[in-house]
């Protein structure tokens, strides 16, 4: 089940409310929404030249 | 594939309306949000409305609220822009796009991360 | 509503070049900042999501910063294809707001 703000007033933003696991808090939207996983790479070895860019796993579609 | 696909754009004369249609493939609406962005000729984005097509909830640029409305057929993947008492400030290519969410602490980090091709609607006499 | 402003509204560089575009929002924004690249007659694309994390597919050489009011976005080696149009764009609160554009044009 779906669990998020109960009304949507206007723009005043409820805090953030549990979500189920596959789902985060979108602020934006004030609602639960599917979400997909951030991933960090790990650190390139000594020597790289630049940090490697943060990415993230795609939302199940 | 993940794809987006606009339609209904036209010329229509000040005071009259018109409905875009969104069509989504490749994925389901109902699993986040969708917006309408628009682009008047030589200017920047200006976002118009969005929905949640699983909570109905929606929101609209103050330009546009009390004369548009978007909804959403979650049977037919599909989100609407319907425009009512159209200007000529309207005038513009309009998109639907797609915002993904990562989980950032629970909380979304996230952009809009596809698109559609956009229609141009002019208002004109 | 969020104001975004961009600096600078337009640039000329050479291929090679470090670029780098800057956005403030009016209030506090946390990271809920996007960057999109947009060129003519074509939709935009997201370039950079949360500030910081590159969206997939996106090349590296592009890269986003900031926190809270300031934010960077950096191609580290501009390529011929990168001449376009960016936007930033907040989503910490409704309405979602673009910053008014920066144009990349050669010099």
């Known amino acids: 089940m779906r669990r998020g703000p109960r009304s949507l007033r206007g723009r005043d933003a409820p805090a953030p409310t549990p979500c189920v696991p596959a789902e985060c808090f979108d602020l934006l939207v004030r609602h639960c929404v599917a979400c997909g996983l951030l991933r960090t790479p790990r650190p390139k070895p000594a020597g790289a030249s630049s940090p490697a860019p943060r990415t993230a796993l795609q939302p199940q579609e | 594939e993940v794809q987006l696909v606009e339609s209904g754009g036209g010329l229509v004369q000040p005071g009259g309306s018109l409905r875009l249609s969104c069509a989504a493939s490749?994925?389901?609406?109902?699993?986040?949000?969708i917006h309408w962005v628009r682009q008047a000729p030589g200017k920047g984005l200006e976002w118009v409305a969005w929905?949640?097509?699983?909570?109905?909830?929606?929101d609209y640029a103050d330009s546009v609220k009390g004369r548009f409305t978007i909804s959403a057929d979650t049977s037919k993947n599909t989100a609407y822009l319907q425009m009512n008492s159209l200007r000529a400030e309207d005038t513009a290519v309009y998109y639907c796009?797609?915002?993904?969410?990562?989980?950032?602490?629970?909380?979304?980090?996230?952009?809009?991360?596809?698109w559609g091709q956009g229609t141009l609607v002019t208002v004109s006499s | 509503d969020i104001q975004m402003t961009q600096s600078p509204s337009s640039l000329s560089a050479s291929v090679g070049d470090r670029v780098t575009i800057t956005c403030r929002a009016s209030?506090?924004?946390?990271?809920?900042v996007a960057w999109y690249q947009q060129k003519p007659g074509k939709a935009p694309k997201l370039l950079i999501y949360s500030a910081s994390f590159l969206y997939s597919g996106v090349p590296s050489r592009f890269s986003g910063s900031g926190s809270g009011t300031d934010f960077t976005l950096t191609i580290s080696s501009l390529q011929p294809e990168d001449f376009a149009t960016y936007y930033c764009q907040q989503s910490h609160n409704t309405p979602p707001t673009f910053g008014q554009g920066t144009k990349v044009e050669i010099k």
């Open positions: 796009a797609r915002r993904v969410c990562y989980n950032r602490l629970g909380v979304c980090a996230g952009g809009m991360d596809y």
């Open positions: 209030q506090d924004v946390s990271t809920a």
């Open positions: 490749g994925f389901s609406i109902s699993s986040n949000s």
């Open positions: 929905i949640t097509p699983t909570h109905g909830s929606t």
